[in-house]
């Protein structure tokens, strides 16, 4: 469960891939599309509002009666629109929605290497936002493998 309904903090940041491609958002036919692309030097990077929430693991999950605290995040590139996981289509979409946000809009934040993060679906543990064919997609990651695979790593820059 998410602790409280308010984020503990928020920040504006641009989102890029491990290979420094930018995540951009474009309004097309009254809906937003998400692109992964190389930006021209002079083009301004799109900013995303990251809202950080705390979430408790049920104590049964941790196996020893001790709750674990996770950091969860929602990502909003423009007012009233949030990134959401579509687990059926294995896709990441932008949807207009009102608060309280659906679970599909929440992602567990994983700090990875020095300056990289990953976003794990709250609704589907082991499934992460990743890059596939120049688009964002949901990618299943085997926990026994290295979670550092580059296609699920993102950089946040203020």
């Amino acid at each position: 469960s998410i602790t409280g309904i308010s984020p503990i903090t928020e920040s504006l940041a641009s989102l890029s891939t491990y290979n420094d491609q930018s995540i951009t958002f474009a309004l097309e036919d009254e809906s937003y599309e998400i692109y992964v692309e190389d930006l021209k030097k002079d083009k301004k990077k799109d900013k995303v509002l990251l809202s950080y929430y705390e979430s408790q693991h049920p104590s049964s999950e941790s196996g020893d009666g001790v709750d674990g605290k996770m950091l969860m995040v929602t990502l909003s590139p423009t007012k009233d629109f949030w990134l959401q996981a579509n687990n059926k289509e294995h896709s990441v979409e932008l949807h207009k929605c009102e608060k309280p946000l659906p679970d599909q809009a929440f992602f567990v934040l994983h700090n990875r290497s020095f300056n990289c993060v990953s976003f794990e679906c709250k609704t589907d543990p082991g499934v992460f936002i990743g890059v596939k064919d120049n688009h964002l997609a949901l990618i299943k990651v085997d926990y026994s493998e290295n979670l550092g695979s580059e296609n699920i790593l993102f950089k946040l820059s203020e």
């Epitope: 503990i8 903090t9 020893d64 001790v66 996770m70 950091l71 934040l109």
Partner: antibody
Amino acid sequence: EVQLVESGGGLVQPGGSLRLSCAASGFTFSSYALTWVRQAPGKGLEWVSFISGSGGRPFYADSVKGRFTISRDNSKNMLYLQMNSLRAEDTAIYYCAKSLYTTSWYGGFDSWGQGTLVTVSS
Amino acid sequence: DIQMTQSPSSVSASVGDRVTITCRASQGVVSWLAWYQQKPGKAPKLLIYAASSLQSGVPSRFSGSGSGTDFTLTISSLQPEDFATYYCQQSNSFPFTLGPGTKVDIK
């Protein structure tokens, strides 16, 4: 109740080695990142090293890089700090601490051990 | 590396006083700043994380604020058990760095 208990400190000569241990209990050990922080006598706190829950790529302060190695054994709920080529300026109380969050280091460190004293002197 | 500075380095105050400690980062750390309290001979204790979130079990007279590079720890009404040294720490990027500490002692 979360418990972290450091051991392995003592007196060692300059250039010598020491291995610190931190025994953990009361939480799902492998889910949490851990860190070592030290405090020289009468001085402030200095971050030393960090390791993720899985034991992935560790991080070190410049002052110990190449001399200290952090590691963990998730099957034994143990954290270690191997300290080589010790110098007088490494004299300090060494604390181990666990991260607040299971998947992120952003929240700082919410549980600390009582510390173990390392004295480097001839 | 991100340098952390704290001011004042020490403050003398009386029980009931309002005490404010500031922490400045040499570059932005978003809100990923924690405050710790340490008493002589004891381990540090987490008071505030994410700049303004109160750690479980910490009295509400402690509060934190700020983002980016400038942060503040406030003790609204100093209690006898609050005489200690306070440290800020950024956990936005490696190497993690701590401020030099602010000692709060009895006037």
